[in-house]
């Protein structure tokens, strides 16, 4: 039975040209995290595998950095980066947990962080 929950940074905003950290945290389970995938819509941005380490998609290498932790840092943001991002936690023995973050990249200098929320 899957008892864990994913806590994410929720709905966030950032300035064009700036950077943002996408962060998820798996709690309420003793399952072992074996791999975390970061996806934007249907595109795989990066994987952090417990055995093999990080692999960043070459298409995003110049603008995506691993970490901190299991999170992902997006740099040199453009308005095209606005959209949904997913952290997909592969665990043993539970299976897969998915968290969602919505990022809005703003032209203006006003960029507020949304409240944290949980996805079961």
């Amino acid at each position: 039975m899957m008892t864990g929950t994913i806590e994410t940074t929720g709905n966030i905003s950032a300035e064009k040209g700036g950077s943002i950290i996408l962060q998820c945290h798996l709690s309420s389970t003793t399952a072992q995290v074996t791999q975390v995938n970061w996806e934007q819509q249907d595109q795989l941005l990066a994987i952090c595998n417990a055995d093999l380490g990080w692999h960043i998609s070459p298409s995003f290498k110049d603008r995506v950095a691993p970490g901190p932790g299991l999170g992902l840092t997006l740099q040199s943001l453009t308005v095209n980066d606005t959209g949904e991002y997913f952290c997909i936690y592969h665990t043993y023995p539970d299976g897969t947990y998915t968290g969602r973050i919505f990022l809005e990249v703003l032209e203006s200098s006003v960029a507020e962080h949304g409240a944290r929320f949980q996805i079961p």
Partner: antibody
Amino acid sequence: EVQLQESGPGLVKPSETLSLTCAVSGYSISSGYDWHWIRQPPGKGLEWIGFIRDSGSTVYNPSLKGRITISHDTSKNQFSLKLSSVTAADTAVYYCARGLFWYFDVWGQGTTVTVSS
Amino acid sequence: DIQMTQSPSSLSASVGDRVTITCRTSENIFSYLAWYQQKPGKVPKLLIYNTKTLAEGVPSRFSGSGSGTDFTLTISSLQPEDVATYYCQHHYGNPLTFGQGTKLEIK
């Protein structure tokens, strides 16, 4: 078009060190992907050896760890394998390959290495 | 280590036949399975990754399915140029491992 080409001595004596190089053309090895070595003993299946990242960090097959060193030379756009204390069991065709999320999308032609005195 | 077991180890089929090769893993690898084709005397070629995604230039008669521990490579209509040995490989942990291969021949 990305191309990989292995080179190195075809014959190595037992207990010596096998040294191979993979020259990459059509893509900069410092621009992403992982760069792997895989081998295939005569008439047998494939065995993954290890890889080097564009950053220079390495991951090795635990069954060979301690005998393997993978390094790269970004100025020459090539990466290399050293396998120490070889025995006849290390006789194989050695392939270099480009890795994307740990599967292999481009392979070199392979080079045959025989371990014999 | 994740063990990869392919079956059958060899098979013979006729041109136009539907051919199925299976790969079973010793533990859950989710969808992280690739298939390669190695023609006699040639270099392995990536056919499929992430269980079902066809690599660039691979004919649509090849398809992959499965998840967890059981996976299948299917050739919908066997062609003479499909004579080869086929290998599965998980791309999920260290060490990366391959199946022992399935040798496919034409009757």
